[in-house]
Structure formats: structure tokens, C-alpha cells
């Protein structure tokens, strides 16, 4: 008695696919050991055709796969494009050899059935239209024409030329002649349903001189396409239902017992379980559309169907396409926070994982909008300008080699609440969904900038301070200048870091930045933030306005400014005296380079290492893109 279980007999027809599930006992060893599918030879030897170690035999090349589902203790063998040569005895099993634990499976592949010579076979999918062609001799040109369906010995009339239509074919069947043709009539049956399948007889005339034709109608249920996706990845259902339903509402539904529950349709219906992680996109004017679901969960596995009907709901006799989605829990996509919470006026740092093998891919962040089909306009990207309304408060920090990038959004308002997607132009499976929840702030923000009314005067020295609480004592503090392509880290000086680590005076933890001398191009948004290595934390933003010195205003020289800064105990401002260098050398030239060259993992890793020192106790500073 084998502990492995599966289907003992599998039967299909040529050209079809089979999906064979083998069940194994739920043990750690079984979950991780080799899985195989082999063909039993007459000599007792079982020749491996495919295994979970990556082996694929020549005869299965391009048409078979083996997928392990450890969380279900199953593995699935898919074989497509079956031929009669595939008929035989097989084993599905576990172990390093093909003699371990196994289960015997018999596969029988038959020819597509043939019919008598005078029978025309029509094969159509559910919901489609069939046109049955009926030939007759000239002698029956003016005789009654009819189509009937065989039920046992009887043949029940479906439609005839006297305008009779069987009630079950009402509004679906029409009998017509084309042009001047005197020897053929046609019967169209639309919105085909499974019970329409069977043998039909068309007839012109009565009695022994009647002309008869046999037609065998096969109505095919949609063969589900098998989709295997990792937990937390995304899936796209590509739906092509044909021109005849191009103008009807489209839907995607999930089969549940005898119903199919609509997940999304083009009339604005959407299942709350997919809120924030689904998009329906029309592909062309011929009725093609796709549905993308991100952040796949275990419970998303199941049978899906797309279709079209004016109601936006599944309707018998309308075309459908089917899929079976499997969700593999052994995912390469890391588990990241699905909900991020922030407060008004505060900030959030969202970590977006991406395929580490694609560090040069372009990264994006978009805001999912719940219009009728769902859409996700890009707010920021490695080569996309920050969207209007997000200037000065949104930036994307790439961290090449780490398999993640960070998006920071500050000056939060409750309108920022909603769903956001992390995506790249590379591996589409790595789309992740984050729900941002912004609540009203109940206390002062952790980071505060002084002066809050920041106006700098050209040619003078301008110092801006960022006060941080003791809880950020051990973290790196930085200042950066926001621009449309990121927030570039500036030299700054952290006062709190110079204190003894034994005590922490809540009132005197300051990181300051000095512009000396102020230039017109210094105008803009500046961020004060904290981070630990490549993990970004809280930020706050301030807009620094720059104005010409008005006549009569006192000129404060840099030393006075420094002296004034020194009046505040524990605070020692560090000026940007190497202003020319900073503006020229430290701005990343690749920001203006060709699109293909914009990402260079090596360089950027260097850059991030440099910025890691900004504001450290030794007074070192660095700048980064």
C-alpha cells in the first residue's frame, strides 16, 4: 500500500492537456525531496520524463512541467499536446531514485472520435455561434426546410421554414439562404449551451425524395488554462472573447460551488477582497481585455472565468474563458508590510522589494484608484517626474543590490490614505501592494525644523536646524535637497552625536545644515530625515525661499552667523564651504545620461555608502543621489 495517492486512470484525447495531481504524506522530508514522473517500460525500468530537480526529457521538451506545492503536500504534472504515443503506464513518486515511494498512473490518449462519412462535425465553445450547412437538390428548392435534433429514435424540430422555432432555441436559431444559392440553406444557433450538443438532421422536402444531412455538434466547456504563481506575486488573466461581444460588459469571476462570483466588471462592480490590488484593462476594440491581480494570497487559488454579457454578470450561453490558479507558498518574493500607518503632517517610508537579479530595472510607485476598472497612475519613478501635487514630499531611493527600493512620502494628509503599488519595468511578478492609512496626528511630530518660516537671502549664510528626539539618538541623521529626481543628501552636522551616550538631553538633539553663501538655485524643498544603513525612517520637509538682499537690510557675515549659531549650546553648524564642489562634483552625472545608462548598480552602491556617513560624529559629510 503506497502512501502516495493520485489518479489511477487518466483518459483524454489527442491534442489535449492533462494535469495530474499526486498527493504525498505531509512530512518535512517529503516536502523537500525530489519529485518525479516516469514511464514504466516492459523491462520493469521506469524512465524519468520530468523531475523537480530540473530534469526534462526530450519527448517532454516544451510541453510538460512539474510543480511542487509543499503547503498542500501535492505536486502536479502538466502534459500538453497529447498524442496516442503518450498512452502507457507511469509512476509519480518521491525519492532520489525511481524506486522509492510511488503511485501507478495509467494514461490513455484516444483519437478524436470519427463519424459516418455523411456527418459533418461542428466543434464550438460554449457561448459561440454555429452555422450548420444543409445541402439539397433542385427538386426540393421550394419544399419545406427544417433542422431537427435527434433524441433517441425521435428527431425533434428545432426550426423550420414555416417560422416554427422550438422554445429552447427561441431568439437563438435562424434558418436562412445566402444570396441566390438554390442548393444550400443554413441554420445559425447562437449562445451555445452544453445541452445543445448532439446529432442534428437537416432536411429539405418530405418523404422518400427528401434531402437529409447529418451534423454532429460538439459544445466544448472551456478547458481551464493552468496558472502557477508564487505567494505575494501577481497574475494577469488575458481574456479574448471575440469580436461578437466587443461591445458587451466584461467581467472576471471566481467559481464558488454552483455560482461564479464576480470579482470585477466593466460596470464598476468589484469584490472588496480585491480592493487595491486589481486592474481591468481593455486591450483593443475587439473585446480583448486583461485583469491584473497583485499581492496574491493563498486563498486566491481557485477556478476563474472571464466572460461578457450586457449585465456584467455570468450568463449561460455567453462566451467564457477559464483558468485554474495555483498559489505556491514557497515564494521568492519577500514578505513585506501590507499596511503602513502614518499621521497627518508626518511621513512614511515604504520598502518596495524587486527581483534582485534586475537591479538595473526602472522602479515606480503608483496610486491605485478605484474608478470603474481600477487604475494606477505613476506618482514617482527612477526616470519619471514626480506627479503634480507631490512636489517636495515624495521621493524614491534606489538601493541597488539590496533587492529593494524605498519610497518616502511626507507632509501626509488623510487624502493620502489608500492603496499604492510598487512595480518595475522588469519581472512583473514583483508587483506589491501597500495600503497606506493616515490618521489625524495627536501629538507634535518627532522631527521639527527651525526656523519654520525659512527665507534665505542671496549671498548670506543661512542655517536651518532639525530637532530630533532621543529615540533617534543612534540613527544617522541627514539633510537632503529635494528635486524631481530624488532627494540628494547634503553635508550636515549632527550635534547630538557629540554628547556622551550616557545621557540624552531631549531639548538639544539637533542636526543642522548651512548654506554659505546662499544662491538663487538653493531655493526649494529640503528634507531632514533619519535612517539606519539603508533603512529610511521619519522625514520632515521645509521649503526654503531665496530672496535678493533688500537695501538697508543688515549684512551678516558668515562668522557672525556662526557665532550666533554657537550661542545655542551644543549646536555647532557646519557650513557648505565647498559649495562649488558640492554643486558640481556631487550631482550624479548619470541623472542626465541616456535612459539605458541611468542605473549602474556598482556606482550607486558606492554612493549609498558615502551617504551613510552624513552627519556622523566625526563631522564627515557625504552627498548622494
Amino acid at each position: 500500500q503506497s502512501p502516495i495517492f493520485g489518479p489511477q486512470d487518466v483518459s483524454s484525447i489527442e491534442g489535449n492537456s492533462v494535469s495530474i495531481t499526486c498527493y504525498y504524506p505531509d512530512t518535512s522530508v517529503n516536502r523537500h525531496t525530489r519529485k518525479y514522473w516516469c514511464r514504466q517500460g516492459a523491462n520493469g525500468y521506469c524512465a524519468t520524463l520530468i523531475s523537480s530537480n530540473g530534469y526534462l526529457s526530450k519527448e517532454y521538451s516544451g510541453r510538460a512541467s512539474l510543480i511542487n506545492f509543499p503547503e498542500n503536500s501535492t505536486f502536479v504534472i502538466n502534459i500538453a499536446h497529447l498524442t496516442q504515443e503518450d498512452t502507457g503506464s507511469y509512476k509519480c513518486g518521491l525519492g532520489t531514485t525511481n524506486r522509492g515511494l510511488f503511485f501507478d498512473v495509467s494514461l490513455e490518449v484516444s483519437q478524436v472520435p470519427e463519424f459516418p462519412n455523411d456527418t459533418h462535425v461542428y466543434t464550438k465553445d460554449i457561448g459561440r455561434t454555429v452555422t450548420i450547412e444543409c445541402r439539397f437538390k433542385e427538386g426540393n428548392a421550394h419544399s419545406k426546410k427544417s433542422l431537427c435534433k435527434k433524441r433517441g429514435e425521435a428527431c425533434e424540430v428545432v426550426i423550420d421554414s414555416t417560422e416554427y422555432v422550438d422554445p429552447s432555441y427561441k431568439d437563438r436559431a435562424i434558418l436562412f439562404m445566402k444570396g441566390t444559392s438554390r442548393d444550400i440553406f443554413y441554420v445559425n444557433i447562437s449562445h451555445l449551451i452544453p445541452s445543445d450538443a448532439g446529432l442534428y438532421v437537416c432536411q429539405a422536402g418530405e418523404g422518400p425524395s427528401a434531402d437529409k444531412n447529418n451534423a454532429d455538434l460538439q459544445v466544448l466547456e472551456p478547458e481551464p488554462e493552468l496558472l502557477y504563481k508564487d505567494l505575494r506575486s501577481s497574475v494577469t488573466f488575458e481574456c479574448d472573447l471575440g469580436r461578437e461581444v466587443a461591445n458587451d460588459a466584461k467581467y472576471l469571476c471566481r467559481k464558488n460551488k454552483e455560482t461564479c462570483d464576480v470579482i470585477i466588471n466593466t460596470l464598476g462592480k468589484r469584490d472588496p477582497a480585491f480592493e487595491g490590488r486589481i486592474l481591468l484593462t481593455p486591450r483593443d476594440d475587439n473585446g480583448r481585455f486583461s485583469v491584473l491581480i497583485t499581492g496574491l494570497r493563498k486563498e486566491d487559488a481557485g477556478h476563474y472565468q472571464c466572460g461578457a454579457h450586457s449585465s456584467g454578470l455570468p450568463q449561460e450561453g455567453w462566451p467564457v474563458q477559464a483558468w485554474q490558479l495555483f498559489v505556491n507558498e514557497e515564494s521568492t518574493i519577500p514578505n513585506s508590510r501590507s499596511v503602513v500607518k502614518g499621521v497627518t503632517g508626518g511621513s512614511v517610508a515604504i520598502v518596495c522589494p524587486y527581483n534582485p537579479k534586475e537591479s538595473s530595472s526602472l522602479k515606480y510607485w503608483c496610486h491605485w484608484e478605484a474608478d470603474e476598472n481600477g487604475r494606477c497612475p505613476v506618482l514617482v519613478g527612477t526616470q519619471a517626474l514626480v506627479q503634480e501635487g507631490y512636489e517636495g514630499r515624495l521621493a524614491l531611493f534606489d538601493q541597488p543590490g539590496s533587492g529593494a527600493y524605498t519610497v518616502i512620502l511626507n507632509q501626509l494628509t488623510t487624502q493620502d490614505s489608500g492603496f499604492y503599488w510598487c512595480l518595475t519595468d522588469g519581472d512583473s511578478r514583483w508587483r506589491t501592494t501597500i495600503e497606506l492609512q493616515v490618521a489625524e496626528a495627536t501629538k507634535k511630530p518627532d522631527l521639527e525644523v527651525t526656523p519654520q518660516n525659512a527665507t534665505a537671502v542671496i549671498g548670506e549664510t543661512f542655517t536651518i536646524s532639525c530637532h530630533y528626539p532621543c529615540k533617534f539618538y543612534s540613527q544617522e541623521k541627514y539633510w537632503c535637497k529635494w528635486s524631481n529626481d530624488g532627494c540628494h543628501i547634503l553635508p550636515s552636522h549632527d550635534e547630538g552625536a557629540r554628547q556622551s551616550s550616557v545621557s540624552c538631553d531631549q531639548s538639544s538633539q539637533i542636526v543642522s545644515m548651512t548654506l554659505n553663501p546662499v544662491k538663487k538655485e538653493d531655493e526649494g524643498w529640503y528634507w531632514c530625515g533619519v535612517k539606519e544603513g539603508q533603512v529610511y525612517g521619519e522625514t520632515t520637509a521645509i521649503y526654503v525661499a531665496v530672496e535678493e538682499r533688500t537695501r538697508g537690510s543688515p549684512h551678516i557675515n558668515p562668522t557672525d552667523a556662526n557665532a550666533r549659531a554657537k550661542d545655542a549650546p551644543e549646536e555647532e553648524a557646519m557650513e557648505s564651504s565647498v559649495r562649488e564642489d558640492e554643486n558640481k562634483a556631487n550631482l550624479d552625472p548619470r541623472l542626465f545620461a541616456d535612459e539605458r545608462e541611468i542605473q549602474n548598480a556598482g556606482d550607486q552602491a558606492q554612493e549609498n555608502r558615502a551617504s551613510g556617513n552624513a552627519g556622523s560624529a566625526g563631522g564627515q559629510s557625504g552627498s548622494s543621489k
Epitope: F5, P7, S12, N16, K257, E258
Partner: nanobody, 126 residues
């Protein structure tokens, strides 16, 4: 809803054959698999055999205890599943239930089936 009606049970001698039928009506289009379970007095309901399908492909599953003796088949046009039982043994005595499922993860698990018939008694005397 799907309604299932079993027939063909009865009293037979050990070694004899019997053919059970299960006719499905209602929304049968949504079914994905149909099978047979049995329950002997004082015992748990036990998996016997199941047939699942996808288009023109059929998958037949059997319990070890009936392999080689029982055969499941279906007539698509009649929405009927048959269980041909050969070489019957006294151990096969039980009430045989027909079950249907819309989505099946493991055909051996009774809770995976959405619809059940009333059952038909099979008694095998020695």
C-alpha cells in the same frame, strides 16, 4: 443546486457484481467531480472512488481496498455516474453515497464535496 439520486443497491452473494448509478440534476454544469463514499454501521464515511473531468479529460481515483475490483464511469449526456462493483466481499457491505463537487482539492476528503445523495444500501453476504 445539484440533486443526486443513487440507485442499484441490494443484497448479493460474495463474489457477485452490482452496478450503482447516480443521476445528477439541477445545475450540473458547475460540477467538476463526482464520486462514491461508503459508510458501514459504526464506522466513518470512507472514500471509495471519484471521477473528475476537465473538458474531454477524465481522472479516476480509487481507494486501495477497491482497486482492480471497482470501476467508475460517467455518461456525460445523461449526467450520470456509474460504479461497477465486481468480486464483492462481505467487507464491502455499507450504505453507498454519491457525492459531487464543484472544486476539488483532495478527492479523498468528504468535506470537499458540496452535494450528497441519500445513499443506497449494499449488502454482501458470505
Amino acid at each position: 443546486q445539484v440533486q443526486l439520486v443513487e440507485s442499484g443497491g441490494g443484497l448479493v452473494q460474495a463474489g457477485d457484481s452490482l452496478r450503482l448509478s447516480c443521476a445528477a440534476s439541477g445545475r450540473t454544469r458547475t460540477t467538476y467531480g463526482m464520486g462514491w463514499f461508503r459508510q458501514a454501521p459504526g464506522k466513518e464515511r470512507e472514500f471509495v472512488t471519484t471521477i473528475t473531468w476537465s473538458g474531454s479529460t477524465n481522472y479516476k481515483y480509487y481507494a486501495d481496498s477497491v482497486k482492480g475490483r471497482f470501476t467508475i464511469s460517467r455518461d456525460n449526456a445523461k449526467n450520470t455516474v456509474y460504479l461497477q462493483m465486481n468480486s464483492l466481499k462481505p467487507d464491502d457491505t455499507a450504505v453507498y453515497y454519491c457525492a459531487a463537487s464543484t472544486v476539488l482539492t483532495d478527492p479523498r476528503v468528504p468535506t470537499e464535496y458540496d452535494y450528497w445523495g441519500q445513499g443506497t444500501q449494499v449488502t454482501v453476504s458470505s
